[in-house]
Structures are given as C-alpha cells and as structure tokens.
C-alpha cells in the first residue's frame, strides 16, 4: 500500500505519461496542406500533457514509442461530394527536424466523409508532427468529428 | 527484482488499469437510439475490469484519461444500403450525469457498413457513456464485427 | 527520485510493455488468403518488442489483454475497383493453436479501399494472429498505409 | 400511425396492364422501402418488389420476368406498381407493405388490398 | 432463392392448448447474429398481421401468447394457450436476402 501512495506522489511526468488529446483550430493558406491543432481544458476535451503545440504543430517532448490517432471528418460532405473531389488525403508525418522527415500514416476519402486510424511508431525529442489533408475540401471543426491525439506507450 | 515482485502483488486496480471491451446485446426500443452492450467472460472475449454496465451503458468508475474506441457495422448492408439510408451516424458521448452531457466522437457511414474511430478524452467517476445509433439499419451482434471499449491511460 | 531511477533501470520486458507493429512483407499464394508481416528497425518504423514473427505471422509472448490495430489499404484502388471486387474482406484472428482459434476483428472494404480498427483482446503466450484478406485486390505496401500492431495493456 | 390505403379492385383483360397506387399517411415515405406482395385467391404470399421513394431505387423479383414496374410520387406519398401482360393466373389481391422502422424486409403495416381479376 | 417450408399444413388444437407450428428454411437465413425470420397471421378478407419479427421479437401489441424461436434454418412459433380469436392462417417468412420469401402458410382451427 505504501508503494501504491508512493507511486501516485511521483510526479506523472518522470513516469513517461506523455499524453495530447488535439481540436482543429484552423486550416493553413491555401498553399499549405497542413491543419493548425489547438488543445488545453480551456477549449473542452483536449490537452497536452508533456508534447507542445508550435504553431499549431505537435513536437514530442519524449523519447519512446507512441500510438498516434486521428480522425477528419470532411465539412458539408456527402459521398457524392466527397467522390467528386477525390484525391482527398489526409497524411499524418514527422515534418521537423528534416533528417527525420516520413509520413507515418496516410489514408484516403474516397466515396467517404470521415477517415479514423492509429497506428504505433517511435518518436523522438523533437520530433514535429504535421497532419496533412490535401483535397479542396474543408476538415470540420467540431470536437467530436475531427481530433488528433498521441499517447505514450513505452521508451 | 525484488521491486518487480512487489509490483505484481499490487492489486491492478491500485495502479488504475481500468479497461473494458463490450459486445453488443440489443439495440433500444424505436424511439431509444442508444445500443446495449453487454460483456463477461462467460459471453466471449468481452470483459470489464473496473467499469461497470448501468442497463447495458457503460458506467466509469477512476477519473483518468482514457482511451475510447468502437466499431460498428451495419447487418445485412451494402454500399447501396448505405447510401439509400444516410444519415445513418453512430456517436459516442457522455449521457449522464446530464451536466457533463456532450458527444465525445461521431462518424456517418455514407456509402460504408463499417465505421471505427477511437480516441483520448478525460472522464470521471459516475461519468456513463451512451452509443446512439441513428437510422433505419441494425448493427451487427456479431462479435467481430461491432464492440466497444475504453482503456485506462492516466490520471 | 530514487523510485523513478529504479525503475528506469528494470527491464521493461518486467513490465510488461510487450509492444509490435509490422509491415506487409508480401502475400501468400493463391490459395493462402493470410497476408505476411515483417518488422524490426532494420526496414523503417516496424519493431517487436517481446512479440515474435513466426513465418510472417504474430506470435504472442505475454498473457494479458492486448490493444489490436490495423490498417490496410488495397493497392491502385478506387471506389470504383473496391465496388466491383466486393466483397474484399479483412480479418483479424488467432489461428494457433487451432484450439483457440478465432476471429476478433473483421471488415468489408465495400466502396473504400482502405479500413482501420483496432480492439482490446484478451491474447495468451503461443496465440498466434493471422490476417486473411479475402478478395482478388492487392494489398499496398507502402509502410504508412498497411501496418498491423499489438499493444499489451494490462494482465 | 402510418396508414396505407390503396386503390379500388379492377377487372382487366388478359395482355392488358394494371396500376395498382398506395398512399402512405405520414411525413416518412421518402424514407421508407414500400414493397407489393399478392396473394391469389386460396393461395400463399408472393413478394413482388419494392422501391425506395428517397431516390426511386427499385428491387424486382425476377419470377415477374420484368412485367413489374413500381414508381413512387414523393409529393403525394404515394406507391404505384404496375404489372403488364396479364393473364389469369395473375388475379389476385395485390398488397402495399411496409415496416414500421428498420429497412429490412418484414412487414409492420399493409394496405387494405386491391383484388385484381383478369378474365376475358 | 430461399424456400420456405412450413409444417404441418393445417393444425387442430384445443382452446387453451399449446399450438406449435415449424418452418424451415432451405439455407440459413440468420446472420449479424440476428435470424432474419418472421411469422404473420392471416383472417379471412383482412391483409396479414405482423406477429414475430427477427425469429423471437413480439410485435408491439401481440398478446404474449405468441412467441418464436429458431435460428439458422429451423424456426418455431408457438402459441401457448389457444384462443378462440387465434384461428387463421399463419405465414414464415425471412428477409435475409431479395427476394423475401413466404412459407405455404398453416392453417390453425379449434379442435
């Protein structure tokens, strides 16, 4: 019992809890693919426990490997929209620094509105994660649609 | 090692490893669009360890982060059924207590039988989560093809 | 402080952080619907951390409950190619020992040429999962649109 | 609750058509598949076809050798089906089906039923 | 397509009875965990009455007298205590694929 007490004093930091939980604050200019990410209790049900938003962008603040989710779902879309404009992709990369640059995951719309993953993979300190949606199609900007998260798993 | 041992003979719930996998019992009467999950080991590979069901709802009980995830699929459907039936929408929220009612996670299906998406949000204890299912379609009970689940990530 | 040092200092496999996630190394023959995986730093982003690959397939190393994630996506596919195969169809089981074996996850591609799930899973030391696609379209093997992991999340 | 009412019986003559309507009370035609079944006299239930008035999709049971055609007029909530070549094993009572909530087909509310007699 | 077979084709049962009437399908007509089966009665000069959906569902405002079991191909509705208002004819019929088929239909009188 003593250790349980001890364990929940640490502070969640040392113990790699490295966890965010990102809303869609808004798309870039018109030459930019990248969406801005904003997160805090201010803004509802996201935050950031350990990583950083920078302009918008998630940079890891720990070493390990993380699980990566996201979810879009495309504004005012139906799949006769959504088929009309396609390619729409979103893709999910290390953007900076640019020896590490690698998309790490990427899906298309096709004849739908929303695409959902996850995937595992290693982060660095450092490391910038810039989602990409290309397509003439605006993400939506409702919390429970479209969303951006990462979770550490282990070192 | 010695450490290692001490931590195994920790109860797991004293290191807030709540998680719960659900499989789909029944769908509500039709004017109650929520599903009713049902799980244990007796019914298959469902389980709940820590959260508890309220009338087939699924009832928190550690405040933390967790991680939620779903998959639903519709019965009998093909990309025509889909399309004929839109809006058929699955979205996951928070129904009860009634002052933190919101909707953590929504996707349409448009022209799929299949939606999965998963994502963090922080809950507390009380917090019950409610799946509502709208449209004319039933969700397959078979148990690889719909389930729910939250897992447990930090306080 | 002490605590955190100690702890960093254990193994992780201790700990119970068994963690994999793979890469599509290639199909099977003709008649042999299982797609094969293969994973370590060597090829990219993939690794296996106590999980093992046993001819291409995942095999388990450590009781307890598991996150499951997938993500195919169907090579030179449109909505039109996924249409006119359907129906293409992945699925996710345990196939050895042949005494536990079992579907846990499965998905119709219908209109779309990508599907993404993931679920929690109770696994046991020796299970063995096997991905069977079913249908005449390839699987991409490009690494950040078809991967498959594990996530050991709790006993 | 939804309430269909179909059109009065007709006698046609062999290789003559029929068209049989079904007017559905309520806002939710659109958004329901009206499907036809008959019934000759003394005999079973037969399943004709069906259509979605959302987008005019229709379904077909191919025993009907594409002698069945079934339309539908959102602004009147109403279901037409219309069988040619008839001959006189196609008399029969021709039924409106609907279920009350799911798109599957089994079915909560019917027609009245309209008898069609086909003699010389 | 699939083939529905009742039996028996006709049924005499005394009031307050149990009457119990078969259907089975030529293939199985469950699937998604459901048995896409359903039961109707039929009276003379009236359309058919929805008692049974999804092989064991009542129907809103069925006495529960009714009721239906089965899965895969074989599906039973029995009525557990025959009244003099249960004399009809009674119809299966699934839904799992187009086109929807019915069985012959069982008649049920009063012995």
């Known amino acids: 019992q003593r250790f349980a007490q001890a364990q929940q004093q640490l502070p969640l930091e040392s113990l790699g809890w490295d966890v965010a939980e990102l809303q869609l604050n808004h798309t870039g200019p018109q030459q930019d693919p990248r969406l801005y990410w904003q997160g805090g209790p201010a803004l509802g049900r996201s935050f950031l426990h350990g990583p950083e938003l920078d302009k918008g962008q998630l940079r890891i603040h720990r070493d390990g490997i993380y699980m990566v989710h996201i979810q879009v779902t495309l504004a005012i879309c139906s799949s006769t929209t959504a088929s009309r404009h396609h390619p729409t992709t979103l893709a999910v990369g290390i953007c900076s620094p640019a020896s590490r640059s690698i998309s790490l995951l990427r899906l298309s719309f096709h004849q739908g509105c929303t695409i959902a993953s996850q995937r595992l993979t290693p982060l660095a300190r450092g490391d910038t994660l810039c989602t990409n949606l290309t397509g003439t199609l605006l993400p939506s900007r409702n919390t429970d649609e479209t969303f951006f998260g990462v979770q550490w798993v282990r070192p | 090692q010695r450490f290692a041992q001490a931590q195994q003979q920790l109860p797991l719930e004293s290191l807030g490893w709540d998680v719960a996998e659900l499989q789909l019992n029944h769908t509500g009467p039709q004017q109650d669009p929520r599903l009713y999950w049902q799980g244990g080991p007796a019914l298959g590979r469902s389980f709940l360890h820590g959260p508890e069901l309220d009338k087939g709802q699924l009832r928190i009980h550690r405040d933390g982060i967790y991680m939620v995830h779903i998959q639903v699929t519709l019965a009998i459907c093909s990309s025509t059924t889909a399309s004929r039936h839109h809006p058929t929408t699955l979205a996951v929220g928070i129904c009860s207590p009634a002052s933190r009612s919101i909707s953590l996670l929504r996707l349409s299906f448009h022209q799929g039988c299949t939606i999965a998406s998963q994502r963090l949000t922080p809950l507390a204890r009380g917090d019950t989560l409610c799946t509502n299912l709208t449209g004319t379609l039933l969700p397959s009970r078979n148990t690889d093809e719909t389930f729910f689940g939250v897992q447990w990530v930090r306080p | 402080q002490r605590f955190a040092q100690a702890q960093q200092q254990l193994p992780l496999e201790s700990l119970g952080w068994d963690v994999a996630e793979l890469q599509l190394n290639h199909t099977g023959p003709q008649q042999d619907p299982r797609l094969y995986w293969q994973g370590g730093p060597a090829l990219g982003r993939s690794f296996l951390h106590g999980p093992e690959l046993d001819k291409g397939q995942l095999r388990i190393h450590r009781d307890g409950i598991y996150m499951v994630h997938i993500q195919v996506t169907l090579a030179i596919c449109s909505s039109t190619t996924a249409s006119r195969h359907h129906p293409t169809t992945l699925a996710v089981g345990i196939c050895s020992p042949a005494s536990r074996s079992i579907s846990l996850l499965r998905l119709s591609f219908h209109q779309g040429c990508t599907i993404a799930s993931q679920r929690l899973t109770p696994l046991a030391r020796g299970d063995t999962l096997c991905t069977n696609l079913t249908g005449t379209l390839l699987p991409s093997r490009n690494t950040d649109e078809t991967f498959f992991g594990v996530q050991w999340v709790r006993p | 609750e939804v309430q269909l009412v179909q059109s009065g019986a007709e006698v046609k003559k062999p290789g003559s058509s029929v068209k049989v309507s079904c007017k559905a009370s309520?806002?939710?035609?659109?958004?329901?598949?009206m499907h036809w079944v008959r019934q000759a006299p003394g005999q079973g239930l037969e399943w004709m076809g069906a259509i979605f008035p959302g987008n005019g999709e229709t379904s077909y049971n191919q025993n009907f050798k594409g002698r069945v055609t079934i339309t539908a007029d959102k602004s009147t909530s109403t279901a037409y089906m219309e069988l040619s070549s008839l001959r006189s094993e196609d008399t029969a009572v021709y039924y409106c089906a609907r279920n009350s909530y799911y798109d599957y087909a089994w079915f909560t509310y019917w027609g009245q039923g309209t008898l069609v007699t086909v003699s010389s | 397509d699939i083939v529905m077979t009742q039996s028996p084709d006709s049924l005499a049962v005394s009031l307050g009875e149990r009457a119990t009437i078969n259907c089975r399908a030529s293939k199985s007509v469950s699937s998604s965990g459901y048995s896409f089966m359903h039961w109707y009665q039929q009276k003379p000069g009236q359309p058919p009455k929805l008692l049974i959906y999804?092989?064991?569902n009542l129907e809103s405002g069925v006495p529960d007298r009714f009721s239906g079991s089965g899965s895969g191909t074989d599906f039973t509705l029995t009525i557990s205590s025959l009244q003099a208002e249960d004399v009809a004819v009674y119809y299966c019929?699934?839904?799992?694929?187009?086109?929807?088929?019915f069985g012959q239909g069982t008649k049920l009188e009063i012995k």
């Open positions: 309520g806002d939710t035609f659109p958004r329901y598949n």
């Open positions: 019929q699934h839904s799992r694929e187009f086109p929807p088929t």
């Open positions: 999804l092989a064991s």
